[in-house]
């Protein structure tokens, strides 16, 4: 009689993760009689799949009827696959005895189990950083197999270039996980931007998966300063106002100081927004001319963000002679904005507070 | 190992029925037909009928179609033969046997129940 | 139905010759190449023991002084050389359709 063949006709076997995997056996010959084993893996660690013969095997089915007669298909169905089900699967062949005696083992089908990344989780840096200033985001999808899958990282539609990705393990696993980080300049003009993560991968079938951050989150952008007298008004009061332009966030306070003396502090909320996600801010104070002999320092100074302190000073020029209605008191801007330049201009709705 | 487990003996009135058990017992039990066998005292051998324990598909020998009726309990990892309106005629042992190889053979045997029919 | 007939329905053979028990078939009992043809062995006061299987093939732990030849309607069990141990009746059993048995083959050893 010609000897007995243990046929595994397919030397690999690709199945997406939840499916169920067909693993196909036939033997050439009814003899010798004695049952069939499926096991995962070779040698003595090999791990017990399906025995025809006995156990309970809840996930494995045989595809062939077994009590049907002359029956040669050992075929199994594994239901409800998971990355944990990879592995080389063995069909073996035993002879009926007591006990039964391992005769023939199948050349084996490797079965890989192709599982979708999961979806990518951008984070940005723990605290805000300035505009003009270089920061990290990360990227982590988990889960996928095989190995090979793509990511991308895109501002604004324009893909980045400062990036570095790792694909963890480097060796063989059941599946996979990969972390990316992107550096990112932030310019005044990234409130509104947003930063996102792209990844293919085969079990996606061209539709990546996509994960955002706002840039919003990340970023601040300190204000312009800029402090204005107004003309004299008729009973000698002078006008003087603090604009605060194009900051973010809104956490912002405001203290005006009379010769260094604290006079009125404010804190900035419900600002409208102007188009590129920042805030305006103006602060007036009323000085009364006539209550002063000397020249009057006022000082408005603003805290951004817990952010230290930003100063702009102006010297209110007292004159010895009476004011005349309506004219213009002498006066000398002494101070410096020391974020950017005075003369920004903004032609945005301005948010005016009024004090007498 | 393979184990069919089968009562000694049933005595029973004629006219009345019996219900034969074999327990089966270190296989997988829907995946093996079980048959049913016949032999009077100093005789031969009878295949009566086999059942297969997963859905229960039976199949007889004529001669005993209105004699024996086959069922199985899957739970309990056996299978019954009932004998109906019994005579002299049917004392015997009545062995089950597990056909191991899907061949339509009987490769392990119970003990067998010795069936006294007597008044 | 296939009709088996066994013959001799008796044997005596001394110890170490050779005992020969024939089956025949009332139509061919192969099909796909193989013969559905089982020799089993039984004691008094036992079951029944498979024997050989399809024709030739020894069961698991039968010993090789046991063999099983034929094909077709014709089929032989020998066994050589006889041991005492091997005082029993034989019988042959098909399943080319649903079994049927023969009528046994009671060996005695002189």
């Known amino acids: 009689e010609e000897e007995l063949q243990v046929i595994q006709p397919e030397k690999s076997v690709s199945v997406a993760a939840g499916d169920s995997a067909t693993l196909n056996c036939t033997v050439s010959s009814l003899i010798p009689v004695g049952p069939i084993q499926w096991f995962r893996g070779a040698g003595p660690g090999r791990e017990l799949i399906y025995n025809l013969k006995e156990g309970h095997f809840p996930r494995v089915t045989a595809v062939s009827d077994p009590t049907k007669r002359n029956n040669m298909d050992f075929s199994i169905r594994i239901s409800n696959i998971t990355p944990a089900d990879a592995g080389t699967y063995y069909c073996v062949k035993f002879r009926k005895g007591s006990p039964d005696v391992e005769l023939k083992s199948g050349a084996g089908t490797e079965l890989s189990v192709r599982a979708k990344p999961s979806a990518p989780v951008v984070s940005g840096p723990a605290v805000r950083a300035t505009a003009e200033h270089t920061v990290s985001f990360t990227c982590e999808s988990h889960g996928f197999s095989p190995r090979d899958i793509t990511l991308k990282w895109f501002k604004n539609g324009n893909e980045l270039s400062d990036v570095q990705t790792n694909v963890d393990p480097a060796g063989k696993s059941v599946s996979y996980s990969i972390r990316s980080t992107a550096r990112v300049l932030l310019t005044r003009r990234d409130v509104h931007s947003q930063v996102i993560c792209e990844v293919a991968h085969v079990t996606l079938q061209g539709d990546p998966l996509r994960g955002t951050a706002n840039l919003s989150e990340a970023i601040r952008v300190p204000p312009f300063l800029e402090v204005t007298q107004q003309s004299m008004r008729a009973d000698n009061q002078v006008n003087v106002t603090c604009q605060v332009t194009k900051f973010y966030p809104q956490r912002l306070q405001l203290t005006w100081l009379e010769n260094g003396n604290v006079s009125r502090t404010e804190m900035a909320s419900a600002l409208p927004e102007n188009k590129d996600g920042t805030y305006n801010w103006t602060s007036w104070l009323l000085v009364n001319v006539s209550a002063h002999r000397d020249d009057v320092k006022l000082t408005c100074q603003v805290e951004h963000d817990g952010q230290p302190a930003v100063n702009k000073s102006f010297s209110v020029k007292v004159s010895a002679h009476p004011k005349e209605q309506g004219s213009n008191t002498a006066a000398e801007n002494t101070g410096t904005n020391e974020r950017g330049s005075s003369d920004y201009k903004d032609d945005d709705d301005k948010h005016h507070h009024h004090h007498h | 190992q393979v184990q069919l487990q089968q009562p000694g003996t049933e005595l029973v009135r004629p006219g009345a029925s019996v219900k034969l058990s074999c327990k089966a017992s270190?296989?997988?039990?829907?995946?093996?037909?079980i048959n049913w066998v016949k032999q009077r005292p100093g005789q031969g051998l009878e295949w009566i009928a086999m059942?297969?324990?997963?859905?229960?598909?039976?199949h007889y020998n004529q001669i005993f179609k209105d004699k024996a009726t086959l069922t199985v309990d899957k739970s309990s990892n056996t299978a019954y033969m009932q004998l109906s309106s019994l005579t002299s005629g049917d004392s015997a042992v009545y062995y089950c046997?597990?056909?191991?190889?899907?061949?339509?053979?009987?490769?392990?045997w119970g003990r067998g129940t010795s069936v006294t029919v007597s008044s | 139905d296939i009709v088996l007939t066994q013959s001799p329905a008796s044997l005596a053979v001394s110890l170490g010759q050779r005992a020969t028990i024939s089956c025949r078939a009332s139509?061919?009992?192969?099909?796909?190449?193989?013969?559905?043809i089982f020799w089993y062995q039984q004691k008094p006061g036992q079951p029944p023991k498979l024997l050989i299987y399809?024709?030739?093939n020894l069961d698991s732990g039968v010993p090789a002084r046991f063999s099983g030849s034929g094909s077709g309607t014709d089929f032989t069990l020998n066994i050589h050389p006889v041991e005492e141990e091997d005082a029993a009746t034989y019988y042959c059993q098909h399943s080319r359709e649903l079994p049927t048995f023969g009528g046994g083959t009671k060996l005695e050893i002189k």
């Open positions: 399809l024709a030739s």
């Open positions: 046997a597990m056909d191991y190889g899907s061949l339509y053979a009987m490769d392990y």
């Open positions: 059942i297969d324990p997963s859905d229960s598909e039976t």
């Open positions: 139509k061919s009992v192969s099909s796909s190449g193989y013969n559905y």
């Open positions: 270190g296989y997988t039990f829907t995946n093996y037909w």
